[in-house]
């Protein structure tokens, strides 16, 4: 978060930013930036694998929920969207695309139908769904 | 949008940002930044006047809907929240806190009950409600 001095190289002048204010990002153009994470909601319905590929093509991944505090904007998301959570049948656990295991108490997992993928819905709910079912999806990019 | 060179004054080094990426803001700390507007959703229920005062105290105003394209993140907002739209009984029009008139076709206006204030709900709907009814609210700050 850069809240001190910003160099506008075009005009070579300093822009003062109040210390209570800050820039967020960097994010892909026209993505949502919140607490230095980038999010985008995609309207077109794809299955989980196509959704994952779409996010990867944009240098991002499907939504990973890692913190109710840092991601409290997700509380108010309407509808159901693919996130990057998959079921590992061998050990019965749920894990994210990056291989990390779903932390307990982060999501309420609800079985919509038999499946190995999960949809995100408001108030930190995860709905189990068949991975080949088309749905809208959320991509996320964590800034460094 | 600053997507060229960013001066990190602390370390006095240039950080290269890909041209497809950009910073968003500046916004108050921990607000949502989207297309260079800042948004915050407040959980506590207040009447319209208290909600307006709360936003003003944060150098912001209640949500103003001015563009379906620039504010398409509002499509997916769950629940009902005060926005800065009020009914002017003298001429029957709906106007924003800044005095501008609601543009036609921006919001579908639905009467919940007799009232002079409006709640924002997903998919660009505005619900007419009594101004003294407590509700959650959305503050917005437009960046220059």
């Amino acid at each position: 978060i850069w809240s001190a001095v910003f160099l506008n190289s075009l005009f070579n002048q300093e822009v003062q930013i109040p210390l209570t204010e800050s820039y967020c990002g960097p994010c892909p153009k026209n993505w949502i930036c919140y607490k230095n994470n980038c999010y985008q909601f995609f309207d077109e319905s794809k299955n989980w694998y196509e959704s994952q590929a779409s996010c990867m093509s944009q240098n991002a991944s499907l939504l990973k929920v890692y913190s109710k505090e840092d991601q409290d904007l997700l509380k108010l998301v309407k509808s159901y969207h693919w996130m990057g959570l998959v079921h590992i049948p061998t050990n019965g656990s749920w894990q994210w695309e990056d291989g990390s295991i779903l932390s307990p108490n982060l999501l309420t997992i609800i079985e919509m139908q038999k499946g190995d993928c999960a949809l995100y819905a408001s108030s930190f709910k995860g709905y189990i769904e068949n991975c080949s079912t088309p749905n809208t999806y959320i991509c996320m990019q964590r800034t460094v | 949008i600053w997507s060229a060179v960013f001066l990190n004054s602390l370390f006095n080094q240039e950080v290269q940002i890909p041209l497809t990426e950009s910073y968003c803001g500046p916004c108050p700390k921990n607000w949502i930044c989207y297309k260079n507007n800042c948004y915050q959703f407040f959980d506590e229920s207040k009447n319209w006047y208290e909600s307006q005062a709360s936003c003003m105290s944060q150098n912001a105003s209640l949500l103003k809907v001015y563009s379906k394209e620039d504010q398409d993140l509002l499509k997916l907002v769950k629940s009902y929240h005060w926005m800065g739209l009020v009914h002017i009984p003298t001429n029957g029009s709906w106007q924003w806190e800044d005095g501008s008139i609601l543009s036609p076709n921006l919001l579908t206006i639905i009467e919940m009950q007799k009232g002079d204030c409006a709640l924002y709900a997903s998919s660009f709907k505005g619900y007419i409600e009594n101004c003294s009814t407590p509700n959650t609210y959305i503050c917005m700050q437009r960046t220059v």
Epitope: - | I110, M112, A121
Partner: antibody
Framework: EVQLLESGGGLVQPGGSLRLSCTAS????????MSWVRQAPGKGLEWVSL????????YYADSVKGRFTNSRDDSRNTLYLQMNSLRAEDTAVYYC?????????????????WGQGTTVTVSS | DIQLTQSPSFLSAFVGDRVTITCRAS??????LAWYQQKPGKAPKLLVY???TLQSGVPSRFSGSGSGTEFTLTVSSLQPEDFATYYC??????????FGPGTKVDIK
């Protein structure tokens, strides 16, 4: 003028089917939830079913669940109640009503517009 | 399920009388209670919603009050056109509506 007009009532045998219609005018039909309420002869009001403004959610009284289907066609400003496996106890005047129930909202503002009712008689 | 009871089930009154009808819920229903008036052979008419808000066009002699489990509809000065049956209605369960059994108000 805000109006609701029901039709489709009549005499039907037990086990039979009937479809009621309710045509709306004078308000933005697609913006409101709609309910069906019935009243058996000489009895009080009984809520039957509600359909949300979008049509994506429908709710039913236990007494009709699995037998009645509430649907809407916003392009025709029309609400429907498909009634199957009818029983003698379904005999009633059926009213449709504009319902100020808003999904997920904390307050309920009642059924503010009612049709004149259509009579359904289930008898052999 | 939430049950509603109304008392009295029947009352006789003179024109000009102050009349109070009570509606009790079997459990708390916040302020989600409405009152309807129905005349013979006619559809019900919404009088009061959200416990105490008068529906547009309803005369001010009608008023509603209460909270939790006990609610009242009051007619401050009964008029000839007020002789009818009155029903309370709740929404608490999501969404399942219940009507009270009704109170018939007759001319004495």
């Amino acid at each position: 003028e805000v109006q609701l007009l029901e039709s489709g009532g009549g005499l039907v045998q037990p086990g039979g089917s009937l479809r009621l219609s309710c045509t709306a005018s004078g308000f933005t039909f697609s913006s409101y939830a709609m309910s069906w309420v019935r009243q058996a002869p000489g009895k009080g009001l009984e809520w039957v079913s509600l359909i949300s403004e979008s049509g994506s959610s429908t709710y039913y009284a236990d007494s009709v669940k699995g037998r009645f289907t509430n649907s809407r066609d916003d392009s025709r400003n029309t609400l429907y109640l498909q009634m199957n496996s009818l029983r003698a106890e379904d005999t009633a005047v059926y009213y449709c009503a504009k319902d100020r129930w808003f999904e997920g909202y904390h307050s309920y503002y009642g059924m503010d517009v009612w049709g004149q009712g259509t009579t359904v008689t289930v008898s052999s | 399920d939430i049950q509603l009871t109304q008392s009295p089930s029947f009352l006789s009154a003179f024109v000009g009388d102050r009349v109070t009808i009570t509606c009790r819920a079997s459990q708390g229903i916040s302020n989600n209670l409405a009152w309807y008036q129905q005349k013979p052979g006619k559809a019900p008419k919404l009088l009061v919603y959200a416990t105490s808000t008068l529906q547009s066009g309803v005369p001010s002699r009608f008023s509603g009050s209460g909270s939790g489990t006990e609610f009242t509809l009051t007619v401050s000065s009964l008029q000839p056109e007020d002789f009818a049956t009155y029903y309370c209605q709740q929404l608490k369960s999501y969404p399942s509506f219940t009507f009270g059994p009704g109170t018939k108000v007759d001319i004495k």
